[in-house]
Interface confidence: low
Amino acid sequence: TIPPHVQKSVNNDMIVTDNNGAVKFPQLCKFCDVRFSTCDNQKSCMSNCSITSICEKPQEVCVAVWRKNDENITLETVCHDPKLPYHDFILEDAASPKCIMKEKKKPGETFFMCSCSSDECNDNIIFSEEYNTSNPDLLLVIFQ
């Protein structure tokens, strides 16, 4: 993905159809790459990223990566193609309309990642276990 400050031109209404025949078009995602964060021990956090980018490719989705080590906490927000691994992990939840953080095993740090497919969905990252596919609010967003 080309970062937003490098993009020269975009097509923000292009269509891609997935295997189920669902039609999609370039996502609007928060795209601040890696920034220091104060998000810690919360059910959900806002990205505090002021840059919204139209993803370069229609198939790309929004991604957020939260990392904590002994020194700092960072939050990464990008567009990424779910067919390709990110930080060596598959984007399993790319079809979700909300960014529900899932912990991944990384030595020496706490590592959470989420991906989602609604405009700017990586602006609100959710750690709470309450958010799953049985949540009626989530179903409302998916099927409205």
């Epitope: 975009v10 097509n11 923000n12 209404d13 292009m14 269509i15 159809t17 669902a22 039609v23 999609k24 078009f25 370039p26 996502q27 609007l28 002021s50 840059i51 919204t52 980018s53 139209i54 309309p97 497919s117 609604s118 405009d119 700017e120 969905c121 602006d123 409302l140 967003v141 998916i142 099927f143 409205q144």
Partner: antibody, heavy 122, light 107 residues
Framework: EVQLVESGGGLVQPGGSLRLSCAAS????????MTWVRQAPGKGLEWVSV????????YYADSVKGRFTISRDNSKNTLYLQMNSLRAEDTAVYYC???????????????WGQGTLVTVSS | DIQMTQSPSSLSASVGDRVTITCRAS??????LNWYQQKPGKAPKLLIY???SLQSGVPSRFSGSGSGTDFTLTISSLQPEDFATYYC?????????FGQGTKVEIK
Amino acid sequence: EVQLVESGGGLVQPGGSLRLSCAASGFTFDIYAMTWVRQAPGKGLEWVSVISGSGGTTYYADSVKGRFTISRDNSKNTLYLQMNSLRAEDTAVYYCARRGQYRDIVGATDYWGQGTLVTVSS
Amino acid sequence: DIQMTQSPSSLSASVGDRVTITCRASQSISSYLNWYQQKPGKAPKLLIYAASSLQSGVPSRFSGSGSGTDFTLTISSLQPEDFATYYCQQSYSTPPTFGQGTKVEIK
């Protein structure tokens, strides 16, 4: 039920200003990009502008760039179009419309308001 | 900008007729085409997206086809409520552009 209701249209002199509003209900407003489309009397449809769900990204048709400003207040579920330096050729019915999420349809407009008429004349 | 040209600009037909409207893009837009119906004094309504996908709630007598630069909207058996103006729109690139419209009138 998804509803979009425009207001703020009226008669204005060339060079004048007007602000249109679009009150949205029946859906989660802040996750949808919203658009304005206009239609001059007896003419076809012309796309005017689009704004992302958070309001962080906006795009404009060349014909209105630098004169019109699209914005939104997600706490009020309301979309706005501030129109400055109005010209006779801006006379049209202005529709606000929702840009569909990919699970539903293409980034075309799946729900439209009833429109509000803007007349620019001296 | 991509130019969209519809034909005919108007047509007269009777209830039960098969009606075909064509739309041509000035450059290839793959299948990135939508069709809208508009009745006098009303907002447009989405009928077909991605050239051939029927929008939810739209009667099956409406169908779309085509790819590249040439597209067709077909109404298999015209009903009284179908008399309206129809617009094609490309959603391949910004700005999304519309055809000039085809008015379907009662013969």
